[in-house]
């Protein structure tokens, strides 16, 4: 996160760290807990690393440096990448992770509510992006979970800023015209959440941007509301019943 500040314990209890253990262990992506056994993240996090057993998912943590060999983590039972995601495109950058064992909810580890299907009418004015990613383009992974308040921008405005790309209605953009605040490398897959009527909702999944926090280059996020049918289909067909946090 560029231009962010430290988060507090329990402030973003749905935020998880997706880490890979090969020879060493490192944080690669963020994710959002959406049910006892489900994490929503970005499909591109798994490019070149589709093997389930190399991944470790840490939930209920604030500081990555607190992780030791004794810190509990979740393992992956199944990775479900959107069927239309292609490595050669930036579309449908969304994936579900089914955990091997369900997680208990605590003050520091609980799910984020999902938006209503095709939610286009809600005007979100209080949106935040969180993650342990770089604090500048040529930076490094941060120890303490960072947060930053970023306004949404219209898809029309976003398309103007990214003429070489196709900004679809299944994407949502956020950023300041002057730059300075944005997600960055290592924040991929993490949440863009907005508070509406006193409730936090998962509006976007951190997907891509041209550099980080550059002027007139907003961050681009996968629009969760556009994938609600897919999320419900995959979680229900796997579970037999839905266990998602839907909005009240």
């Amino acid at each position: 996160i560029v231009g962010g500040t430290n988060s507090s314990w329990g402030e973003w209890p749905w935020q998880v760290s997706l880490q890979v253990k090969l020879t060493a262990q490192r944080h690669l992506c963020g994710g959002s807990l959406i049910g006892h056994q489900w994490v929503l993240t970005a499909a591109h996090c798994f490019d070149g690393l589709p093997l389930q057993d190399v991944w470790r998912i840490y939930s209920g943590i604030l500081n990555l440096s607190d992780i030791t060999k004794d810190t509990p983590f979740s393992q992956i039972k199944e990775i479900i990448i959107h069927q239309n995601y292609k490595v050669s495109e930036g579309n449908h950058d969304i994936a579900l992770i089914k955990l091997q064992a369900p997680l208990n909810y605590t003050e520091f580890q609980k799910p984020i509510c999902l938006p209503s299907k095709g939610d286009t009418s809600t005007i979100y004015t209080n949106c935040w992006v969180t993650g342990w990613g770089f604090s500048k383009e040529k930076g490094e992974i941060q120890n303490i979970l960072q947060k930053v308040n970023i306004p949404l921008v219209t898809n029309e405005e976003c398309q103007k800023r990214y003429q070489d790309y196709k900004i679809t209605q299944r994407m949502v953009c956020a950023g300041y015209k002057e730059g300075g605040k944005d997600a960055c490398k290592g924040d991929s897959g993490g949440p863009l959440v907005c508070k509406h009527n006193g409730m936090w909702r998962l509006v976007g999944i951190t997907s891509w941007g041209e550099g980080c926090a550059r002027r007139e280059q907003p961050g681009v996020y996968t629009k969760v509301a556009e994938y609600m049918d897919w999320i419900l289909e995959k979680t229900q067909s796997s579970d037999g019943k839905a266990q998602m946090q839907s909005p009240a």
């Epitope: 050669s88 495109e89 930036g90 003429q163 070489d164 924040d187 891509w208 041209e210 980080c212």
Partner: antibody, heavy 125, light 108 residues
């Protein structure tokens, strides 16, 4: 299966014009940035021009700026290169290529993942 | 413009040998925008490596790419007969997009 098929090459006199076409199939053409690359006989590869998915944004190499025009018709899945005021140094095999733009670590990637077989343009009197 | 300088110009090696091809750029290039292509006579170029180190679909694991910033390397661990040809590095970080002049890998 992704396919790119160029046509329109041939022999033309200096100062003449030619229009190359590239017919695309096997993918959603309107989602991809497309490019032209050329290769003079016995020489290396030279990027010529690219066009955004919508066709609204184009960029050219200095060597062809003001003489060549790239365009596309997404309804016909076809890319074009209109070449005017041709010179002997424009003699080359012209390739069209699809520009893949995936995502890696929150940044976009860019590379030419599929190429046509090329069409030869010879500028000579 | 970003200049791409490949070395050596020609590499004469026997099958089974290791080939190391270098590509230097005149300015910093984001690794995501660095690719390698192979071209054999009479054929269109073929994508080998993108993002400086990711193998394209169907490319055997004897091909590997490394590098960061201004220095990039393509390695062929054990040359096979079909690997002979010309190899180009290319950047699309900044326009004009540019290619290296190529390294020809020939049979010794």
């Amino acid at each position: 299966e992704v396919q790119l098929l160029e046509s329109g090459g041939g022999l033309v006199q200096p100062g003449g014009s030619l229009r190359l076409s590239c017919a695309a199939s096997g993918f959603t053409f309107s989602h991809y940035l497309m490019t032209w690359v050329r290769q003079a006989p016995g020489k290396g590869l030279e990027w010529v021009s690219y066009i955004s998915p919508s066709g609204g944004h184009t960029i050219y190499a200095d060597s062809v700026k003001g003489r060549f025009t790239i365009s596309r018709d997404n309804s016909k899945n076809t890319l074009y290169l209109q070449m005017n005021s041709l010179r002997a140094e424009d003699t080359a095999v012209y390739y069209c290529a699809r520009v893949a733009r995936g995502i890696a670590a929150r940044q976009r990637t860019s590379y030419y993942d599929y190429w046509g077989q090329g069409t030869l343009v010879t500028v000579s009197s | 413009d970003i200049q791409m300088t490949q070395s050596p110009g020609t590499l004469s090696l026997s099958p089974g040998e290791r080939a190391t091809l270098s590509c230097r750029t005149s300015q910093f290039v984001n690794s995501n925008y660095l690719a390698w292509y192979q071209q054999t006579p009479g054929q269109a170029p073929r994508l080998l490596i993108y993002g400086a180190s990711s193998r394209a679909t169907g490319i055997p694991d004897r091909f590997s790419g490394t590098g960061y910033g201004t220095d990039f390397t393509l390695t062929i661990s054990r040359l096979e007969p079909e690997d002979y040809g010309t190899y180009y590095c290319q950047q699309s970080s900044r326009t004009p997009w540019t290619f290296g002049q190529g390294t020809r890998v020939e049979i010794k």
